[in-house]
Amino acid sequence: QFLKEGQLAAGTCEIVTLDRDSSQPRRTIARQTARCACRKGQIAGTTRNKPSCVDARIIKTKQWCDMLPCLEGEGCDLLINRSGWTCTQPGGRIKTTTVS
């Protein structure tokens, strides 16, 4: 929380690839790869829908919502078996992210 990000220095990330598959109606599948230079005790994650360095504890325990991965105003819920998380928009639309 509040760790410095900017240029690709310690504690920072940049998006390397972003692939979108919109072939299925009403559904878009996106695969994103980021490159992060994280400090000791941190690991690449997602904060406010952007790549970031987060505490390794969050990844180890699969408490994905602790990264604050969703945008402000959305609700975060863990998927069953903690394979990822969902972000629920105020209108009810749900965005699901799985971790691989």
Partner: antibody, heavy 113, light 110 residues
């Protein structure tokens, strides 16, 4: 969107006290929640934080003296064994990676025999 | 443990520019935030991530950071700017996470 603290009152030393922060208009699942206190005429003092999962961290001086817990729309702060030095206004604050942008008005705790 | 040091009090003439500093005793790896607090009120976030302003905060308030010192600059000080100003930053991560406030600076506008 707002926060409101409640539960502040006059207590005698050693009597446990629980303060409650009630959140309105947003989900606690997408923010960090912290408790901060301010003794009369003094500066701000961070007590601790709770993450969406319920994981908590405390200031080194606060460990063992305070317990933070959370429910769907509330965050509690228990002062386990108050002393006169715990007399202060207690604030809850909503945070994310941009800092603490939303604060409650505070609730006053007075510890006196 | 990280300690943030601020001058206890600073005076500025109406309409002048004033800079408030916050010095960390060790080089902080984290962003600084600044909060304004008026008597009897809750703190208000003025600056986050060293230099960014939340919406609604006048552009008279600006932040900068160099080395282990963060600076809040108020241009064209107004009577309503009279308040206490606190800097803050996080320290550590994982099981050692801490959030630290400076001692605060009382700004008087004359």
């Amino acid at each position: 969107q707002s926060l409101e603290e409640s539960g502040g009152r006059l207590v005698t030393p050693g009597t446990p006290l629980t303060l409650t922060c009630t959140a309105s208009g947003f989900s606690l699942s997408t923010y960090y929640m912290s408790w901060v206190r301010q003794a009369p005429g003094k500066g701000l003092e961070w007590i601790g934080i709770v993450y969406p999962s319920g994981t908590t961290y405390y200031a080194n001086w606060a460990k063992g003296r305070f317990t933070i817990s959370t429910a769907s729309t509330t965050v509690d702060l228990m002062i386990t064994s108050p002393t006169t030095e715990d007399t202060a206004t207690y604030f809850c604050a909503r945070g994310d990676s941009f800092g603490y942008g939303l604060w409650g008005p505070g609730t006053l705790v007075t510890v006196s025999s | 443990e990280l300690v943030l040091t601020q001058s206890p009090s600073v005076q500025v003439n109406l309409g002048q520019t004033v800079s408030l500093t916050c010095t960390a005793d060790t080089l902080s790896r984290s962003y600084a935030s600044w909060y304004q607090q008026k008597p009897g009120q809750a703190p208000v976030l003025l600056i986050y991530r060293d230099t960014s302003r939340p919406s609604g905060v006048p552009d008279r308030f600006s932040g900068s950071s160099s080395g282990n010192t963060a600076t809040l600059t108020i241009s064209g000080a107004q009577a309503g700017d009279e308040a206490d100003y606190y800097c803050a930053t996080s320290d550590g991560s994982g099981s050692n996470y801490q959030y630290v406030f400076g001692g605060g600076t009382q700004l008087t506008v004359t």
